[in-house]
Interface confidence: low
Amino acid sequence: GQFRVIGPRHPIRALVGDEVELPCRISPGKNATGMEVGWYRPPFSRVVHLYRNGKDQDGDQAPEYRGRTELLKDAIGEGKVTLRIRNVRFSDEGGFTCFFRDHSYQEEAAMELKVEDPFYWVSPG
């Protein structure tokens, strides 16, 4: 069946060193356990995280994200997933694309991450 992929409408903000969560879901909601789900960084797809055949495909991940990502799948039965990135770096700033692939049917959503320096926001005094 056909579906749309929904991501956050506004940029997500995170501080360097923190962790951040990038939500993504399909609409209408349906079980995505058997789908391929992933995030990549355009242009031209540095793979941030890939889930296929019911498991995370660590081998396909870009080296800069190995060991730093986790796909939260508690609600995958309703078509909702969240990518958690730990130890956020300045280089994580920019566009991310989440996609769901069901056999030959695919849809995606773009989202943006803004990374800020925690020390910049320390108030004087």
């Epitope: 990549y40 355009p42 242009p43 031209f44 081998g59 694309t97 996609f99 995606e108």
Partner: antibody, heavy 121, light 107 residues
Framework: QVQLVQSGAEVKKPGSSVKVSCKAS????????ISWVRQAPGQGLEWMGG????????NYAQKFQGRVTITADKSTSTAYMELSSLRSEDTAVYYC??????????????WGQGTTVTVSS | DIQMTQSPSTLSASVGDRVTITCRAS??????LAWYQQKPGKAPKLLIY???SLESGVPSRFSGSGSGTEFTLTISSLQPDDFATYYC?????????FGQGTKVEIK
């Protein structure tokens, strides 16, 4: 139904530039990845580079770096490929091709009809 | 860049023959391999993606197999419409590459 329609044939002088367009219809243009692939007479397919319009940044094959510029106009759903400093070896058919979302991990499922570029003095 | 090597370059066959084309990658590309068919004066057409998945609308006589560095395209019973040039393409890396092509001609 996705369609990619390219601009017409061009004849160019050595040293000049050519700009080929590729207008997409059907689907969501911004989330495609549009690549350019060329084929010299009697030769195989050669990937030149591509762009994801929603992000605007292009990626180029090493061989064409500095000589090719790929752009996209989201308002008209059109991608462009400009090749400069033309030489006779650039005589070829130039194709635009679409991959859904990204050309990495997704193959080209739709192609333009091709644009013949002839470089001759 | 990853090099893709196809063999043979030319293949002579008759209608009804079983035809196999091989594609070898210079390094592992997992299953990120596509096969295209091209006829003279026409754009390539996607036949197989992800090494073994048949594109919608492509006849079932076409099949693909392999992973890592070795891949094959098989046409189980060659039809008159199948005389064409076939290309493999890897889409595992940022810089995409094609094989040099295999021309299937009438014996």
């Amino acid at each position: 139904q996705v369609q990619l329609v390219q601009s017409g044939a061009e004849v160019k002088k050595p040293g000049s530039s050519v700009k080929v367009s590729c207008k997409a219809s059907g689907g969501t243009f911004s989330s495609y990845a549009i690549s350019w692939v060329r084929q010299a007479p009697g030769q195989g397919l050669e990937w030149m580079g591509g762009i994801i319009p929603i992000f605007g940044t292009a990626n180029y094959a090493q061989k064409f770096q500095g000589r090719v510029t790929i752009t996209a106009d989201k308002s008209t759903s059109t991608a462009y490929m400009e090749l400069s400093s033309l030489r006779s070896e650039d005589t070829a058919v130039y194709y635009c091709a679409r991959a859904p979302y990204s050309p990495t991990y997704y193959p080209f499922d739709y192609w333009g009809q091709g644009t013949t570029v002839t470089v001759s003095s | 860049d990853i090099q893709m090597t196809q063999s043979p370059s030319t293949l002579s066959a008759s209608v009804g023959d079983r035809v196999t084309i091989t594609c070898r990658a210079s390094q592992s590309i997992s299953s990120w391999l596509a096969w295209y068919q091209q006829k003279p004066g026409k754009a390539p057409k996607l036949l197989i993606y992800d090494a073994s998945s048949l594109e919608s609308g492509v006849p079932s006589r076409f099949s693909g197999s392999g992973s890592g560095t070795e891949f094959t395209l098989t046409i189980s019973s060659l039809q008159p419409d199948d005389f064409a040039t076939y290309y493999c393409q890897q889409y595992s890396m940022d810089h995409l590459t094609f094989g040099q092509g295999t021309k299937v001609e009438i014996k």
